[in-house]
């Protein structure tokens, strides 16, 4: 039975050209986390494998940094980065848990005056 829950940063906004941390946290389960996938729509951004560490997809190598922890840092943000991001926790024996984050990348002036979910 899957008892765990994923907590995420929810809906966040960030400034164009800046960076943002995507964070998820799995709680309420003793299941072993074997791998965490970070995906944008159907595109794989990065994977943190418990045995082998971080693998960053080649196409995102220059704009994605691992961490902190099992989180992911997106850098040099563009308006095209706006959208849904998913953290997918592969666990044993529970199975797969998925968390969702919506990121809105705003033009500089808009982000400065209207960002409601800005993460420093």
């Amino acid at each position: 039975m899957m008892t765990g829950t994923i907590e995420t940063t929810g809906n966040i906004s960030a400034e164009k050209g800046g960076s943002i941390i995507l964070q998820c946290h799995l709680s309420s389960t003793t299941a072993q986390v074997t791998q965490v996938n970070w995906e944008q729509q159907d595109q794989l951004l990065a994977i943190c494998n418990a045995d082998l560490g971080w693998h960053i997809s080649p196409s995102f190598k220059d704009r994605v940094a691992p961490g902190p922890g099992l989180g992911l840092t997106l850098q040099s943000l563009t308006v095209n980065d706006t959208g849904e991001y998913f953290c997918i926790y592969h666990t044993y024996p529970d199975g797969t848990y998925t968390g969702r984050i919506f990121l809105e990348v705003l033009e500089s002036s808009v982000a400065e005056h209207g960002a409601r979910f800005q993460i420093p």
Partner: antibody
Amino acid sequence: EVQLVESGGGLVQPGGSLRLSCAASGFTFSDHYMDWVRQAPGKGLEWVGRTRNKANSYTTEYAASVKGRFTISRDDSKNSLYLQMNSLKTEDTAVYYCARGQYYYGSSSRGYYYMDVWGQGTTVTVSS
Amino acid sequence: EIVLTQSPGTLSLSPGERATLSCRASQSVRSSYLAWYQQKPGQAPRLLIYGASSRATGIPDRFSGSGSGTDFTLTISRLEPEDFAVYYCQQVGPPLTFGGGTKVEIK
């Protein structure tokens, strides 16, 4: 051409130290994990340890038999891998190979790891 | 630590024959973490198979790998003179470990 060339082997007394080098060329060194593997005379292959890549903060892992005595490091600016061997024992006598670790994902949930490029090896003899 | 046991230790066969090499793990191994290497005297190992069944670049199709869980097999469908060598299986771990090797020698 993708190539690894080891150097630094030689004869050393028990308790002594030696530093092996591995020069890499023909690929983006900083992207790759790098492993050291050794082979004692007439024996099989034994993994010594590994350094991960830049994305993984160059973290290192070691076999139990060398932990605390051997240190793996790298210099991406020189495309070079190193193995510092201290407190050497006679059982460390072997040919030492450096190898490129290939860590990638064929799909979102299948991580592959293997050593696809090997150096020619350098011989370390520990004897009094 | 996962122990890989290879059998037989030595396989005596003639060119043209089929070779079947076994690698058994002390506990379950992800198939994508299992690789096979060939080593000839005085040479470095060479990658043959990765992910239990995928041939490395430039490896002839007479080499094939199969298996999952704790039992893996390397098959050489028709032995060529250059195939007589020692073969090692390897898993990622941690820690990474090799099997003890199987020597394929000319009968």
